[in-house]
């Protein structure tokens, strides 16, 4: 007997172990989040439909009524009975859709009442027979394997009326007769048979909740009787096929069992884990245990449902046990919604397909699994641009791949659900599940591929997932004069040196009278000494941290409001300037060069002197003049020691502050640009000749990718995001002296259409000349890559002018604050800057990620490695003049995302050692790497190299 070959052992199953496995997922093993790999050779790729959902023609050519035809008429508010995709009429269009996808199989169901209108096997309805013959022959002509479901919920209404449907045992034999006819008629062309699709839902919603046809509810006993009869009907058909048809047709037969997945509230709680097991067993186990397990209902059910659950005799247990040649599994929205579809037992429903596959493996002895239905749904208004469906599919498919490759689950095929939009049961036409969009109101019912169809086609074509964006890691080193830095935000100056020890000449005794006070000893005078930089406690601390970092450069920002409290030169805080000079000089003693930012606004605090803030801040053009005076002071006081200046940190993010209207945003940005340019010219003319430094402004420069690569508007949105975010400042400075044409035109067009009242300011000829070329290098703060889509927005705000919406790709490695780790975005950004604005020196002035770990910050280490790798590729392969990399940031701030190498109370994290290694190696040298910086080779042209020689 065929089922004796079965290799299933170990009953009862051990599915509950899934929840207690606790694999301690590493935050940086990207393969645990997303696996770039291929599926096994000859993996079975398919797509499915259900007859009732797509065939239409509900009373055409002699078809009989089904329970669902009746249910629509009596229970559902459906405006049209002919709203389906009409596959019965448009077979050729379905075949073209299948050709497009490149699938190896098509899973469809036969409509029992289309073949036998009253449900009994007499003479088959000729037109129905002709349709299925044509479908099968056409599939085989295309080398597409048919996977045929005998029963996908459309019971002939006559059998419901006459016998009460599946409550009646008579249906077991009637179903077997129908199956026999199908085996006889189609079996020569069909190698894979499914008897019943998701019997759980037939019983639960058809006879329990009444959500499905025939719409009966309230009779718990009926629910389990129906389940019992469905099991026996399946079993009978399997034995029939096994005995009478398998020997010559050599096919396989199973039943599709559907389920949800559930996670315990508390992973460590045995009680919660048992509840999860109970939840799974009462849905999937109800049918799986008899067939794939020991032949009986799960113990949980037999104990709990004693009065309503029919019992199997020993003979029946033997009869039903093993009646599946593979495990056909369905995982989709029908098992998740509505919420009363499953017993949650107070635990958390989850879409983790990998976990449920592992549960099946453990519970039922690692069977071969065909995923017979998987997918999600979109709202009915979504047409071909089903972006979220791509992410859902990507996630599901990758979970399957991980189950196969990492967990040894024996999945041999996958059915994407569904080929077409169609009738979605209790949702009728309010949701869509097709890979192809069908307009149900159109006469021709064209099948238009959605983005998800393009995506699925790509996955099938590649038999898995290729990491197209990334390139292999390189071995190699950065140039000798490369700046390895760390960035800190504003350094608040200490008003006085923290210790009076060397400025007060008196001697004190502590606690002489037991009052815990200092008492001056009269008549004794000590020698004092001048204040030293190291008297500043914060500087001492900083130097300690910087020395541990082993960096060559330290980027920090001055506090404008501290240096010039009144905003003009009438009151200069000399102590603050002395503090900053100390920071620089002490750093230089350790061979740590400064990169100084003059102005570092933050979301919470604009960092402007109070009088400037009160007179309008950056909305007042006179602030630019005040900034020039402040910058001039800093150049005079610190410029002999500082060779790299940043005027303004992330002026393109000031929109977060000046966001009352877009015109405020654009005006503030305009004034910032002019202020920067004035300062650049001041430095260029007055200070560069003697100080020989370089000056720029640093831009927040995240890369953007289309959320949906199959939709032109998303590509345009990605480019538009870059125009509004980076080109907004880069174009005037590095190219034309004016704002990007694309940005100007986009805003103007929205304003013309009444969608915005934004106006981008105009530069005068003098201002254009002033701004153009007013930066010596690119200073890029790059953290992540954003996935963007087009979404038209009304209103006069900078954010809405862009018509951009962000999406999170759930399959990507991301930080706690949801920053995606996508190193190749950095490479793309560097190339984009060079291609658009020319071959300038580049400094990555901030690059980092938040990591929750207080000590072993693995995510940060992984991030550092990968992003520095991209910088190295940009240098070695793209020949980009990358001069420095500044990791972000030195210390973290309390109650903010954790970006620091040191905690807010100065505790070191392990990423410091990792960064040390990168710095010491100057990159990623090979074992027998080329010449190092301290070796004479040719005529090196960098001062650092010459100093080292």
């Amino acid at each position: 007997d065929y089922k004796d070959d079965d290799d299933k052992l170990d009953f009862p199953g051990d599915g509950r172990a899934v929840w207690s496995q606790n694999p301690n997922l590493s935050p940086v093993n990207e393969s645990q989040l997303f696996l770039y790999d291929t599926f096994p050779k000859n993996f079975f790729w398919g797509v499915g439909t259900g007859a009732f959902q797509v065939e239409g023609s509900w009373k055409k050519d002699g078809k009989g009524l089904s329970v669902w035809d009746h249910f629509i008429a009596t229970h559902l508010n459906v405006s049209s009975r002919d709203g389906s995709s009409d596959s019965y009429i448009f077979l050729e269009k379905d075949l073209s859709a299948l050709d497009f996808l490149g699938v190896s199989f098509y899973q469809f169901s036969i409509s029992w009442p289309r073949l036998f209108p009253d449900g009994t096997v007499a003479v088959a309805n000729a037109k129905g027979l002709q349709y299925y013959n044509r479908l099968l022959d056409s599939l085989l002509l295309r080398n597409i394997e048919p996977v045929v479901t005998l029963y996908h919920w459309d019971l002939p209404w006559a059998l419901q009326e006459k016998y009460g449907g599946w409550k009646n045992e008579t249906l077991i034999d009637l179903f077997n007769d129908y199956a026999t006819y199908c085996f006889q008629t189609f079996g020569d062309r069909v190698k894979y048979w499914i008897t019943i699709h998701n019997p759980y839902l037939v019983a639960w919603h058809g006879y329990g909740t009444g959500l499905h046809a025939p719409g009966e509810k309230g009779n718990v006993a009926a629910v389990y009787t129906v389940g019992h009869n469905l099991l026996k009907a399946h079993s009978k058909v399997w034995h029939n096929y096994n005995r009478n048809f398998r020997p010559h047709q050599k096919g396989w037969l199973s039943i599709t069992l559907g389920s949800h997945w559930i996670e315990p509230n508390r992973a460590e709680s045995i009680v919660d884990i048992l509840k999860c097991q109970q939840s799974m067993v009462s849905v999937l186990g109800w049918f799986a245990n008899p067939i794939h397990g020991d032949g009986d209902y799960p113990e949980v059910m037999t104990k709990k449902l004693l009065s309503v659950l029919p019992a199997f005799s020993e003979a029946e247990k033997n009869e039903v046990r093993g009646t599946a040649d593979f495990f056909a599994f369905s995982f989709g929205p029908n098992n998740f919604k509505p919420l009363n579809t499953m017993a949650k037992m107070g635990q958390n429903v989850s879409l983790n397909l990998r976990q449920v596959l592992n549960w099946i493996k453990l519970e039922y002895g690692n069977p071969r699994i065909l995923i017979a239905e998987n997918g999600w749904f979109t709202d009915s208004y979504v047409q071909t641009e089903d972006t979220t469906a791509i992410y859902m599919m990507k996630n599901f498919l990758n979970q399957v791949l991980q189950a196969i490759r990492l967990d040894g689950v024996r999945v041999f095929g996958y059915t994407a659900w569904s080929l077409l939009d169609g009738f979605e049961w209790q949702d009728a036409y309010n949701t869509r599940r097709g890979l192809f969009y069908v307009d149900f109101n159109s006469e021709q019912r064209e099948r238009r591929p959605k983005s998800s169809a393009h995506y699925y086609k790509q996955v099938i074509g590649e038999n898995g997932f290729t990491l197209r964006e990334a390139t292999p890691d390189l071995q190699g080193q950065f140039p000798c004069d490369f700046s390895w830095g760390v960035t800190e935000s504003v350094l608040k100056p200490e008003s006085v040196a923290s210790s009076p020890q060397f400025s007060d000449p008196h001697l004190y005794v502590w606690n002489a009278t037991g009052n815990r006070m200092l008492h001056r000893v009269e008549g004794v005078r000590l020698k004092t000494r001048p204040a030293q930089c190291t008297d500043f406690i914060t500087i001492k601390k900083q130097l300690e941290m910087l020395a541990r970092m082993k960096v060559t450069h330290f980027r920090f920002a001055l506090d404008w409001a501290s240096v010039l409290p009144t905003g003009n030169l009438s009151e200069v805080n000399r102590q603050a300037l002395r503090y900053y000079r100390c920071v620089v000089t002490e750093g230089l003693k350790l061979n740590i060069s400064p990169m100084v930012t003059l102005y570092y606004p933050t979301h919470a605090h604009l960092g402007l002197p109070a009088p400037l803030l009160h007179s309008g801040g950056w909305l007042d053009p006179s602030t630019a003049k005040a900034f020039r005076d402040y910058a001039g002071l800093c150049f005079r006081e610190l410029g002999d020691l500082v060779k790299l200046w940043i005027t303004i940190n992330e002026p393109n993010r000031l929109s977060d502050v000046y966001n009352r209207t877009s015109n405020d945003t654009y005006q503030a940005a305009h004034n910032l640009l002019i202020a920067h340019a004035i300062v650049w010219h001041l430095y260029d003319r007055q200070y560069r000749p003697s100080q020989r430094g370089a000056l720029s402004l640093s831009l927040h420069s995240d890369w953007a990718e289309p959320a949906n690569p199959y939709v032109a508007s998303h590509w345009q949105a990605a480019e538009r995001f870059l125009q509004f975010e980076i080109a907004w400042f880069a174009e005037p400075l590095f190219k034309t002296g004016d704002y990007p044409v694309a940005m100007r035109e986009y805003i103007a067009s929205k304003t013309r259409r009444g969608l915005s009242s934004s106006v981008l300011p105009r530069f005068s000829d003098a201002e254009r000349r002033l701004v153009k070329g007013a930066a010596d290098f690119y200073a890029l703060n790059h953290f992540t890559t954003r996935f963007v889509m087009h979404e038209q927005q009304n209103g006069s705000r900078y954010d809405s002018d862009r018509d951009v919406q962000f999406l999170q790709d759930i399959t990507r490695l991301a930080s706690p604050s949801r920053l995606a780790v996508m190193p190749w975005g950095e490479g793309k950004l560097l190339r984009w800057m060079r291609n658009n604005y020319g071959d300038l020196d580049v400094y990555i002035t901030a690059n980092g990620i938040d990591d929750q770990a207080l000590q072993n910050d693995q995510l940060r280490q992984y991030y550092l490695e990968k992003y520095v790798q991209e910088a190295l590729k940009a240098y070695l392969i793209d020949k980009i003049k990358i001069k420095g990399y500044y990791a972000f940031k030195l210390t973290e701030e309390k109650s903010k995302p954790r970006f620091g190498f040191f905690t807010s109370d100065f505790k070191a994290k392990s990423s410091i050692q990792f960064y040390n290694k990168l710095i010491t190696s100057n990159g990623f040298p090979s074992e027998n790497g080329g010449p190092r910086c301290n070796q004479t080779q040719g005529n090196p042209e960098c001062t650092v190299c010459l100093l080292l020689l």
Epitope: Q477, K881, R932
Partner: antibody, heavy 116, light 107 residues
Framework: EVKFLESGGGLVQPGGSLRLSCAVS????????MSWVRQAPGKGLEWIGE????????NYTPSLKDKFVISRDNAKNTLYLQMSKVRSADTALYYC?????????WGQGTLVTVSA | DIVMTQSPATLSVTPGDRVSLSCRAS??????VYWYQQKSHESPRLLII???QSISGIPSRFSGSGSGSDFTLSINSVEPEDVGVYYC?????????FGGGTKLEIK
């Protein structure tokens, strides 16, 4: 105007050595990577190697690594290719070019003939 | 080493024709492919970088496409002065190998 001018080619005996030079003008030589590419008579192009602006990184095609040395003198705006242990297969037109990253500026080439 | 295979080796065309020259890499090289034109007795000239980005000063009839391992250089409407040999180059992994070239000639 950007100019790359190769020199130093000529007839050389098998097993012998030769140093090719490439004088560069019209660009800030010290800021750019430089490459050598060769083309045997009637054949296609073969990438020889490249050198970084500060000479800290030099990449070669593996088969030529042991017989060719690329160097540069930024003070003289000159790129060099030192060839040793030459064979008849090394007969070719030798071009210097700037990779940024594709080879956007080329010299006219200098012909090296290896023959007894 | 990455092997770049160009096809066809020779292409005879009529002025005004649209032609496609193929280049296949032995492994995926993202979009790191550069195309050059070399006319008789001249140094090569750069046409396309990063598989599809055109170079200023190059006639707009030249365009590139592809990513991964299959790349195409297209000439929209061939002019007599387009005769010469066209090379693709891998710009992704050392050594930066060239294809064997496709010779374009006018019938």
């Amino acid at each position: 105007e950007v100019k790359f001018l190769e020199s130093g080619g000529g007839l050389v005996q098998p097993g012998g050595s030769l140093r090719l030079s490439c004088a560069v003008s019209g660009i800030d030589f010290s800021r750019y990577w430089m490459s050598w590419v060769r083309q045997a008579p009637g054949k296609g192009l073969e990438w020889i190697g490249e050198i970084s602006p500060d000479s800290s990184t030099i990449n070669y095609t593996p088969s030529l690594k042991d017989k060719f040395v690329i160097s540069r003198d930024n003070a003289k705006n000159t790129l060099y290719l030192q060839m040793s242990k030459v064979r008849s297969a090394d007969t070719a037109l030798y071009y210097c070019a700037r990779p940024s990253p594709a080879l956007d500026y080329w010299g006219q080439g200098t012909l090296v003939t290896v023959s007894a | 080493d990455i092997v770049m295979t160009q096809s066809p080796a020779t292409l005879s065309v009529t002025p005004g024709d649209r032609v496609s020259l193929s280049c296949r890499a032995s492994q995926s090289i993202s979009d790191y492919v550069y195309w050059y034109q070399q006319k008789s007795h001249e140094s090569p000239r750069l046409l396309i970088i990063y598989a599809s980005q055109s170079i200023s000063g190059i006639p707009s009839r030249f365009s590139g496409s592809g990513s991964g391992s299959d790349f195409t250089l297209s000439i929209n409407s061939v002019e007599p002065e387009d005769v010469g040999v066209y090379y693709c180059q891998n710009g992704h992994n050392f050594p930066y190998t060239f294809g064997g070239g496709t010779k374009l000639e006018i019938k």
